[in-house]
């Protein structure tokens, strides 16, 4: 048999089995599984006197290895004393030693439960800049415990002064906190809370979980915006690759055309996301005429971490065409916000869904960041609709009280645009409040639909104008409702207000 070092175990009695008046007590040390002979067992008894006896080695039948026991009998104030048994096995190595330090007897104890808890992600499901791990050591018989944090099995230099212990009844609980940077947490290392108690080790480990439902890499290819296509006349398409694992391999994006004709030079951007993944964007300028005539463009994505190439293609949307209808409204003055107003623009019944929305003031296009426009949604019919919202200031409307909502869409004639003007104070801007320029329905809050409308510009609504519970042909989101003109045989009464 080959050389084998021993395993060493302390041998003690249960404390409750030792008479309280006992003047001496025996404890032992077992060295087992070693080969060849001999082992040397020595004892450190501290300040106490003791006698030792090492029993002859016995052979373990199956392995042919040896086992031996050394006994120590001590007298005096042994109850509070710790004893060390040193086992040396020179055949393993000249300096091979195993020390076991223990008390005379073992108490009955309840071992701790060790559990690591992890701080949650933010509302968007992303990891915050720092991650807290809380090691909960609970339900053990009070006594000394040692907590160590390990990173991939290596002891970490952690300030353990923050560890707090509480006692509930006969059992105790301790908790220790570890704060990690997002970078460390996302690096896929394993973190372990190791607890030593009564000569035993208890632990729990954790690491960043893989997505329970990993999406894998995805690629998306956008069509050019109608604004770029018809107004700027410099359309671009964008190939977006998301959820890439950052790695040494680079993402390869190749553009092609179904016709086989050459493509223009593309621009590329890489962005590291908060969740540790990489997003790659490639933007390709396309010919306005090529696009309108139905050319198909293809973006091919390869990467060492992708099992197969991903292909995305895009072309002009086929199907029926319908020009958008554009309606623009101004909200009335709201208590506490006299110097600001919100303008709303409803654009509906257009096909296909590709549309660009702009706001203009003083014949100048306002930056896109100024307004908020919903994604196209299907109406109950076959078309689409969007809402656009613009906040304007008193300084703007006092300079010129006319704002234009413009929709750019391929079916709009003559120049792919439809626009509507709206004023904050229609009565003051265009003469009277009863001007003929607004539709016979306005936005209002369905939550207050029983109240009388409050008119803008001091005008009073017709008594028979009431809030409808939502017209079937009004495709707005649920929080919007409509006011319906009910006056029969009279000129339409127009107002803008809240119900």
């Amino acid at each position: 048999a080959s050389t084998q070092s021993p395993s060493v175990f302390p041998l003690t009695r249960c404390c409750k089995n030792i008479p309280s008046n006992a003047t001496s007590v025996t404890l032992g040390c077992l060295a087992t599984g070693y080969f060849p002979e001999p082992v040397m067992v020595t004892w450190d008894t501290g300040s106490l006197n003791g006698t030792t006896m090492t029993l002859p080695a016995t052979t373990l039948t199956l392995s042919g290895h040896y086992a031996t026991i050394s006994l120590l009998t001590v007298s005096g104030a042994w109850a509070k004393q710790m004893f060390t048994c040193r086992v040396a096995h020179t055949p393993s190595s000249t300096d091979w030693v195993d020390n076991k330090t223990f008390s005379v007897c073992s108490r009955d104890f309840t071992p701790p439960t060790v559990k690591i808890l992890q701080s949650s992600c933010d509302g968007g499901g992303h990891f915050p800049p720092t991650i807290q791990l809380l090691c909960l050591v609970s339900g053990y018989t009070p006594g000394t415990i040692n907590i160590t944090w390990l990173e991939d099995g290596q002891v970490m230099d952690v300030d353990l002064s923050t560890a707090s212990t509480t006692q509930e009844g006969e059992l105790a609980s301790t908790q220790s906190e570890l704060t990690l940077s997002q970078k460390h947490w996302l690096s896929d290392r394993t973190y372990t809370c190791q607890v030593t108690y009564q000569g035993h080790t208890f632990e729990d480990s954790t690491k960043k979980c893989a997505d329970s439902n990993p999406r894998g890499v995805s690629a998306y290819l956008s069509r050019p915006s109608p604004f770029d296509l018809f107004i700027r006349k410099s359309p671009t398409i964008t190939c977006l690759v998301v959820d890439l694992a950052p790695s040494k391999g680079t993402v390869n994006l190749t553009w092609s055309r179904a016709s086989g004709k050459p493509v223009n030079h593309s621009t590329r951007k890489e962005e590291k996301q908060r969740n540790g993944t990489l997003t790659v964007t490639s933007t390709l300028p396309v010919g306005t005429r090529d696009w309108i005539e139905g050319e198909t463009y293809q973006c091919r994505v390869t990467h060492p971490h992708l099992p197969r190439a991903l292909m995305r293609s895009t072309t002009k949307t086929s199907g029926p065409r319908a020009a958008p209808e554009v309606y623009a409204f101004a909200t009335p003055e709201w208590p506490g916000s006299r110097d600001k107003r919100t303008l709303a623009c409803l654009i509906q019944n257009f096909m296909p869904e590709d549309i660009s929305v702009q706001w203009l003031h003083n014949e100048v296009q306002l930056p896109d960041a100024r307004h908020s426009t919903t994604q196209p949604r299907k109406t109950k019919g076959s078309g689409f609709f969007v809402f656009s919202r613009l906040e304007v200031t008193r300084a703007e409307w006092e300079q010129k009280d006319e704002f234009i909502c413009r929709a750019v869409h391929e079916a709009a004639s003559p120049s792919q645009t439809v626009q509507r003007a709206v004023s904050v104070n229609p009565g003051l801007a265009g003469g009277s409040a009863q001007s003929q320029r607004a539709p016979d329905r306005v936005l209002c809050h369905s939550g207050q639909q029983q109240g009388l409308p409050r008119a803008a510009g001091g005008s009073v609504p017709h008594p028979r104008c009431h809030c409808g519970a939502g017209r079937a042909d009004w495709p707005g989101p649920p929080e919007l409702d409509v006011c319906v003109e009910e006056a029969e045989g009279e000129a339409p009464w127009t107002w803008t207000g809240l119900c």
Epitope: N213, P214, R215, G216, V217, S218, A219, Y220, D243, G249, S256, Q298, R300, V301, T302, H303, P304, H305, L306, P307, R308, A309, L310, M311, R312, S313
Partner: antibody
């Protein structure tokens, strides 16, 4: 024209090993991701493994460990090594070519090679 | 991993019939669903890729549709040579899967 010819199948005892080869011709192998798909007698198609143009490989969950896919573009050959064969590995093994532009399925298949695992 | 569930497992039809086979993915597929036809003793043949694009040389009576998790293969007017087994495949996976093929649908002569 595109051709994929599998070889290396046959009768093998449980616990044994096999190396299947797929000789490709009529196209540039290095431009294509390649896949092995198997079909047990009277059963459906079952994806086994894929190797991309970079030489990196993926396996169906059940295939990981016993199956090894590799490619030698200079020899225009793709391989599938199967170790510790079991009776349930009995199937026709197809070598297949992924479309060049990707994410569009398999545009060419070999005729398949039959692997029978029996004592 | 995405699982593909095909239904029905078999269908009896006559020449001239319209047949629809469905395939449900356990989660949304952005692109890359393919359909294959397999006849006894032969390897499968690509019919449709990217949900609805007809592979080269495939007759126009075959069509693919669907998005998200629900997909369908329709054979408009069954011909004698269309009696075979049809498989859907999620061909756009970006990591390994248990099986990217549906269980198959056998189209038999009524």
């Amino acid at each position: 024209q595109v051709q994929l010819v599998e070889s290396g199948g046959g009768l093998v005892q449980p616990g044994g090993s096999l190396r299947l080869s797929c000789a490709a011709s009529g196209f540039t192998l290095s431009n294509h991701d390649m896949t092995w798909v198997r079909q047990a007698p009277g059963k459906g198609l079952e994806y086994v493994s894929i190797i991309n143009t970079y030489g990196n490989h993926w396996y169906a969950n059940w295939a990981s460990g016993r199956f090894t896919i590799s490619r030698d573009n200079s020899k225009n050959t793709v391989y599938l090594q199967i170790d510790s064969l079991r009776a349930e590995d009995t199937a026709t093994y197809y070598c297949a070519r992924e479309t060049h532009h990707g994410s569009s399925g398999i545009d060419h298949w070999g005729q398949g090679t039959l692997v029978t695992v029996s004592s | 991993d995405i699982q593909m569930t095909q239904s029905p497992s078999s269908v009896s039809a006559s020449v001239g019939d319209r047949v629809t086979i469905t395939c449900r993915a356990s989660r949304s597929i952005y692109s890359g669903l393919a359909w294959y036809q397999q006849k006894p003793g032969q390897p499968p043949k690509l019919l449709i890729y990217d949900h609805s694009t007809l592979a080269s040389g495939v007759p126009s009576r075959f069509s693919g549709s669907g998005s998200g998790t629900e997909y369908a293969l329709t054979i408009r007017s069954l011909k004698p040579e269309d009696f075979a087994t049809y498989y859907c495949q999620h061909a756009d996976y970006a990591h390994h899967s248990d099986n990217v093929f549906g269980g198959g649908t056998k189209v038999e002569i009524k």
